[in-house]
């Protein structure tokens, strides 16, 4: 169901008057340099806004903070700075919001020159705060146990690991020289520590420790660790192999009790591994190429995280800034978008609809011409701007956007040609999860999805002050404008409650003034634009991943097809906060598409058959599994993790125990005698850059 064309756009009657009555201005009597927002809880309407003003004076930074609180989705704010005793709050730590609807908030104060620090904590959605003195200075934001928000974990600037079991009132030191710490499942804490050195210069000599009882006891689960990461059910560690500076990935699915060596290439000092995405079924792993190439190979794992298939070559992932365009399209199952660096050093966008099984270019939007990058003016593709373009300071204000409850909708900046263009991009929309695209807006914009896709809102990206917002009630086909203020403001951001269920949008910015610029927010409630609640007649049945309606298997992805109830484009109504996506799955027959190439096999381009890797032809396929050397008998296929197909094609696959001992125990990796060969291509390493682009783990 691609975006319908040719429909005349008639504006909604009385829209301006309806919106004017639902536009709420709040001027903050505040000169601060930055503002950070946090929604406290889901559907509570509570927003905290922390403004910070920092001025470097000689060798020190003087700062002040103001805290504001809204209970009505940002329509009005109250200055509650007195609740934090007018203390300067560290903006780099932001506002730490507790998991689920706990109502917990932590603000970390900047107590310059002191040996300890101070936090302000709230358990009532920011209505009141109490302050607690810390016996340490935090190195990063304090983290909550995802399953018990009273339990907090903190790493100090002296690399000590601290824990509180009573929401910050009392703290106990768990460990010294801790380099990285993370919450695992069920209150487990994993951390790397260096028993005889520092964190900075001894990577590769770290111990991976685990505690399941909040620090009463510890277990060393791995040694010679470079870094570790958690993704889905998997615990990964990059381990020094004993061959000089090479590292290899080991994986555990039982919280580190047992480990297996992942069948991935080893990497050297200048390379890295990165988990691009992970769930309980599988992992997308990027393995960096040797040398400063700026690309590597994406591998997809089996359900144990051990055997990997090459998914995509020349995957763009810069080592310098740690930028990759890898994007999970959350509005349609199995869809991912990323960029590759082609042989001519141009950057091209690729999309997969089957969780990495096959990658293709994005189809050219029908209402667009091929640009100057296209050799053939009739044949080209859409190329999407994401993190890499943003890092290169191109005129791209936002990364691609999709929401799980706005089924099929993907919005992104892009250009149409043979590669990504440095020219000013336009905004494109797909309403079918990335199969087809339409130019939605001319030039760069900020955009957001409201009411589960019932409304899309956009603001033009401009260096000049703005006072106009654009909105669409038909998934980006037709747009109306609304002048939300007479006096234009310098726009700094669009803010809406996470989850895309709200009908409120806040436009943040600051005033242009002969006196002082002040922070200002305009919150617009679209409830009167979508006057009525949607009814059954407003929805239509849509088959996801449909490319050939004549084919019985049409829509089959990962072994099943899904029919969704989608809002009709012509319906102007409220999905509502409680809207739940209605979908009907049905199982498909198995075909070769439901299988990945097994260890030692690969799929030639544009072929569904798996063939043996030339370098492994005639070799026994052996690898190390749970400390035994295994022999693999296979005709080259294994079921894609999460694939639900039944019947149909069923390739033979058998693993035999060779009764030979081998080890993937990294407590002594030099004893490994496995004859395993890595899958073709690539190599790897790990940093922590989660927040920036939702990458699970990067060495």
């Amino acid at each position: 169901r691609s975006t319908e064309q040719g429909e005349s756009c008639s504006g909604l009657l009385g829209a301006d008057a309806k919106l004017a009555g639902n536009t709420h201005q709040h001027i903050f009597n505040d000169l601060s340099g930055s503002v950070s927002l946090a929604w406290v809880g889901d559907g509570t309407g509570v927003i905290l806004a922390l403004t910070t003003f920092q001025v470097p004076i000689f060798m020190i930074t003087i700062g002040q903070s103001k805290l504001y609180r809204s209970e009505d989705y940002g329509k009005s704010f109250e200055d509650v700075t007195n609740l934090i005793n007018n203390t300067f709050i560290r903006s780099d730590f932001g506002i730490a919001i507790g998991p689920e609807n706990s109502g917990k908030v932590i603000l970390t104060a900047d107590v310059s020159g002191s040996h300890g620090s101070r936090i302000f904590v709230s358990s009532d959605f920011g209505k009141s705060f109490t302050h607690q003195e810390l016996p340490f200075v935090p190195l990063m934001q304090i983290t909550y146990n995802p399953e018990n928000s009273n339990v907090l974990l903190a790493l100090s600037n002296k690399n000590e690991l601290w824990l509180s079991e009573d929401f910050g009132t009392n703290w106990k030191k768990l460990y010294d020289t801790v380099c990285l710490a993370k919450w695992g499942r069920k209150g487990t804490i994993f951390f790397t520590a260096n028993h005889n050195g520092s964190c900075s210069n001894d990577r590769g000599m770290l111990e991976l420790e685990r505690t399941t009882d909040y620090g009463k006891s510890f277990k060393t689960v791995a040694s010679k660790i470079y870094s570790f990461g958690l993704g889905g059910k998997f615990l990964f560690a990059s381990v020094m192999t004993g061959k000089g500076t090479l590292r290899a990935i080991h994986v555990s699915v039982d919280d580190g009790d047992t480990w297996n060596m992942a069948q991935l290439p080893s990497v050297g000092q200048e390379q890295f591994y990165s988990i691009l995405a992970a769930n309980d079924d599988m992992v997308f792993m990027h393995v960096d190429e040797p040398g400063d190439t700026g690309f590597g190979t994406i591998f997809t794992s089996d359900d144990r995280g051990i055997v990997y298939s090459k998914s995509l070559d020349r995957h763009l992932y810069t080592t310098t800034g740690g930028e990759t365009d890898f994007t999970n399209v959350t509005s349609l199952r199995g869809v991912y978008i990323t960029s590759v660096l082609s042989e001519d050093n141009s950057i091209q966008t690729m999309i997969t609809f089957d969780q990495g099984g096959r990658w293709t270019h994005l189809r050219k939007p029908e209402n667009s011409e091929c640009d100057a990058t296209a050799k053939n003016k009739n044949e080209c593709s859409l190329h999407i701007h994401a993190s890499y373009s943003i890092s290169q300071k191109l005129n791209v204000p936002m990364a691609p956007l999709s929401e799980p409850n706005a089924v099929g909708i993907v919005i992104a900046h892009g250009s149409v040609g043979d590669a990504i263009s440095v020219m000013v991009p336009d905004v494109y929309i797909s309403d079918d999860g990335g199969y087809s695209w339409t130019k939605m807006l001319e030039g760069p914009h900020y955009y957001t999805i409201l009411d589960s896709g019932g409304i899309i809102v956009a603001i033009e990206h401009s260096s000049r002050p703005i006072n106009v917002i654009k909105f669409s009630t038909d998934e980006g086909q037709c747009w109306q404008t609304y002048t939300f203020t007479r006096d234009p403001i310098y726009f700094t951001g669009l803010a809406s409650e996470p989850g895309a269920r709200s009908m409120n949008i806040s436009i943040w910015g600051f005033t242009e003034s002969f006196l002082t610029s002040q922070w200002v927010s305009y919150t617009i409630d679209f409830k009167d634009i979508l006057e009525r609640n949607c009814e059954e007649k407003d929805y239509t049945i849509w088959l996801a991943h449909s490319t050939d309606p004549e084919d019985y298997e049409d829509g089959c992805i990962l072994g099943y097809k899904e029919q969704f109830l989608r809002l009709r484009k012509s319906s102007v109504c409220q999905n509502g906060r409680d809207y739940v996506v209605t979908k009907q799955p049905s199982i498909c027959l198995c075909s070769l598409e439901d299988f990945l190439c097994d260890f030692g096999y690969y799929r030639p381009e544009n072929d569904s058959k798996c063939v043996e890797q030339p370098e492994l032809k005639g070799h026994d396929l052996e690898f190390c599994l749970y400390g035994r050397e295994e022999h693999l008998t296979t005709n080259g296929y294994r079921k894609i993790p999460g694939d639900k197909c039944q019947g149909g094609v069923n390739p033979v696959r058998e693993v035999k125990d060779l009764k030979k001992k081998c080890t993937s125990n990294f407590l002594s990796p030099e004893k490994q005698n496995s004859k395993s060969n890595g899958s073709a291509g690539g190599s790897g390493g790990l940093n922590d850059i989660f927040e920036a682009q939702k990458i699970e783990w990067h060495e």
Epitope: L31, T511, S513, F514
Partner: antibody, heavy 117, light 112 residues
Framework: EVHLVESGGDLVNPGGSLKLSCEAS????????MSWVRQTPDKRLEWVAM????????QYPDSVKGRFTISRDNAKNTLYLQMSGLKSEDTGTYHC??????????WGQGTLVTVSA | DVVMTQTPLTLSVTIGQPASISCKSS???????????LNWLLQRPGQSPKRLIY???KLDSGVPDRFTGSGSGTDFTLRISRVEAEDLGVYYC?????????FGAGTKLELK
């Protein structure tokens, strides 16, 4: 501490041009409106030009309109006053001032401009 | 243009005694936003001007509370409850409600 340092003042012939600069420090320059105010030899104060925080809007009194141009470079924390068609009555000490909730909250020490044949 | 008239032009005082300066504008200084943009500045000998009071009665930071500003519309007054030696200099009132912004001619506060 707010610091405003003017420079560029000189002796210039009538009809000549001059560009004054004001370097700002100790505050976030880009969020404040700024003005130039001159003090004449008889100690009278005259507002000369004003620019908004982002540099979008400017204002001048009729006495200098069309001859003076105020500008700012927020990346460099610097305010400018380009003066042309100078007259003897433009002689004075030119002060750079920062605004806040009202006008002329902070003043620089000034730079002397003398227009004389 | 709005004319700002200060009286007296010179005020001779004794240390420790009160002092009062008047400023009258030719038009009301009440802005449409409800604020009245009337400032008082002090220029000590050999220094650049320094703002003491803004929006009629608000004291700038570091200004002693012996200074008070009052008035509305077109009539404004600066009072010093007890003059100290550091208060000597020329006092200017200025308005910022109407363009062009204008200053009074100044009142010189000197020792008797």
């Amino acid at each position: 501490e707010v610091h405003l340092v003017e420079s560029g003042g000189d002796l210039v012939n009538p009809g000549g041009s001059l560009k004054l600069s004001c370097e700002a420090s100790g505050f976030i320059f880009s969020i404040y409106g700024m003005s130039w105010v001159r003090q004449t030899p008889d100690k009278r104060l005259e507002w000369v030009a004003m620019i908004s925080s982002g540099g979008i809007y400017t204002q001048y009194p009729d006495s200098v309109k069309g001859r003076f141009t105020i500008s700012r470079d927020n990346a460099k924390n610097t305010l400018y006053l380009q003066m042309s068609g100078l007259k003897s009555e433009d002689t004075g000490t030119y002060h750079c001032t920062r605004h806040d909730d009202s006008w002329f909250a902070y003043w620089g020490q000034g730079t002397l401009v003398t227009v004389s044949a | 243009d709005v004319v700002m008239t200060q009286t007296p032009l010179t005020l001779s005082v004794t240390i420790g005694q009160p002092a009062s300066i008047s400023c009258k504008s030719s038009q009301s200084l009440l802005d449409s936003n409800g604020k009245t943009y009337l400032n008082w500045l002090l220029q000590r000998p050999g220094q650049s001007p320094k703002r003491l009071i803004y929006l009629v009665s608000k004291l700038d930071s570091g200004v002693p509370d012996r200074f008070t500003g009052s008035g509305s519309g077109t009539d404004f007054t600066l009072r010093i409850s007890r003059v100290e030696a550091e208060d000597l200099g020329v006092y200017y009132c200025c308005q910022g409600t109407h363009f062009p912004l204008t200053f009074g001619a100044g009142t010189k506060l000197e020792l008797k």
